[in-house]
Interface confidence: low
């Protein structure tokens, strides 16, 4: 029987800069029941606080609700593992909420085949930003990426859409059924998961003339 091994805070994510969650990996348990606590302070403060919510994020997590989240200061946090034989601490982790944002996927992806009379046909898609993100404040710039592939193909074709919430694609194979997905990321942060796939059938008479 031994003191617990050193835990590691391995990930912190925020959906929108208003709340965030951090997760840790336990070290070895030393063969005894082990309790974990996360403590933190905001840089510039001496007051130490304990994690306000160990439940919402699931096992080995700490969730910071709105009242505990400030995107203006850096959080300094560590996890303490304790059993009957002793304690061990994780390394301190510095967290700026600004840089850990991982939004939800974009919403309402719609895809249409457009066949204008006098121009090349194309695939037109549009989507909405995730609901938790408030773009009006100017605190966020969201960037988008689209991927698509014929249903039975192995490889995805990826297109960067910048800040647009609509996009056109010209080069498609007539008669094929395509899967289309979109994802987003803030300018400093992480890509969201891909949105659920939207299917679109490209008509056989989709003429790729010059």
């Amino acid at each position: 029987q031994l003191p617990p091994g050193k835990p590691e805070i391995f990930k912190c994510r925020s959906p929108n800069k208003e709340t965030f969650t951090c997760w840790w990996r336990p070290g070895t348990d030393g063969g005894l029941p082990t309790n974990y606590s996360l403590t933190y302070h905001r840089e510039g403060e001496t007051l130490m606080h304990e994690c306000p919510d160990y439940i919402t994020g699931g096992p080995n997590s700490c969730h910071f609700g709105k009242q505990y989240t400030s995107m203006w200061r850096t959080y300094v946090m560590m996890v303490n593992a304790t059993n009957q034989m002793g304690s061990s601490f994780s390394d301190e982790l510095y967290v700026d909420v600004t840089y850990i944002v991982q939004p939800d996927p974009p919403l309402e992806l719609t895809v249409e085949v457009k066949q204008p009379e006098d121009r090349k046909p194309y695939l037109w898609m549009k989507w909405s930003p995730p609901t938790l993100i408030d773009l009006k404040t100017g605190w966020f710039t969201l960037l988008y990426e689209i991927r698509l592939k014929p249903e039975k193909a192995a490889e995805w074709e990826t297109h960067f859409a910048g800040q647009q919430t609509e996009f056109k694609i010209l080069s498609l194979h007539p008669g094929q059924k395509y899967l289309v997905q979109v994802r987003c990321k803030p300018d400093h942060g992480y890509w969201s998961a891909w949105s659920p796939a939207t299917f679109i059938q490209i008509p056989s008479d989709f003429i790729m003339n010059d």
């Epitope: 510039g44 403060e45 001496t46 300094v76 840089y99 400093h188």
Partner: antibody
């Protein structure tokens, strides 16, 4: 060792503009908030502005809001302060500083003098 | 007007004596739990950090320098003054309502 080398000060007329630079070396620049602090001749220190590590967030003293702009180029390890609509009361020695915040050692540049006079 | 008020504004002390400098804030800065830093500035030089996080000494700072904080007040103490300690000393803390840093007005320490 940590170095902050400043440039860009000088004499400018009221209403004019200047751009101050602060070249950092000897530390991982993008890991630190950076700050500008000024000191009018014979007076105390006055905080001017700070900028977060990846630079989307900036704070300004009320006395310079809307006239001064802090920015940084992490690729060039350089901090900037753009001074517009300068007034006589902006005359001061301007210092750049690394990490005035807690849990950070504080390093200061040598200062660059800005004189606003007609 | 939100400020950090240092006292005294100047003091003259003999080598070997003890000197204390006080820094009084308010509920939006020191009293809010924000830490206090102390800087030393000699004529023609940039400020140097002497105490950070209320009572921590950066490496290389002699142990005659110490700091403390209680409520809305912070204190810098130099236990046995040396000639090279003559300088102006400033306290600094983050202020919530200004969303910015505040410096005290400075205390000029002279050697008798």
């Amino acid at each position: 060792q940590v170095q902050l080398v400043q440039s860009g000060g000088g004499l400018v007329q009221p209403g004019g503009s200047l751009r101050l630079s602060c070249a950092a070396s000897g530390f991982s620049y993008s890991d630190y908030w950076m700050h500008w602090v000024r000191q009018a001749p014979g007076k105390g220190l006055e905080w001017v502005s700070d900028i977060s590590r990846l630079s989307p967030y900036t704070n300004y003293a009320d006395s310079v809001k809307g006239r001064f702009t802090i920015s940084r180029d992490n690729a060039k390890n350089t901090l900037y302060l753009q001074l517009n609509s300068l007034r006589a009361e902006d005359t001061a020695m301007y210092y750049c500083a690394r990490g005035l915040d807690a849990r950070r050692m504080s390093y200061w540049g040598q200062g660059t003098l800005v004189t606003v006079s007609s | 007007d939100i400020q950090l008020t240092q006292s005294p504004s100047s003091v003259s002390v003999s080598v070997g004596e003890r000197v204390t400098i006080d820094c009084t804030g308010s509920s939006s800065n020191i009293g809010h739990g924000y830490v206090v830093h102390w800087y030393q500035q000699k004529p023609g030089q940039a400020p140097q950090l002497k105490i950070y996080r209320n009572n921590q000494r950066p490496s290389g700072v002699p142990d005659r320098f110490s700091g403390s904080k209680s409520g809305t007040d912070a204190t810098l103490t130099i236990s046995s003054l040396q000639a090279e300690d003559a300088a102006v000393y400033y306290c600094a803390a983050w202020d919530d309502s200004l969303n910015g840093w505040l410096f005290g007005q400075g205390t000029k320490l002279e050697i008798k």
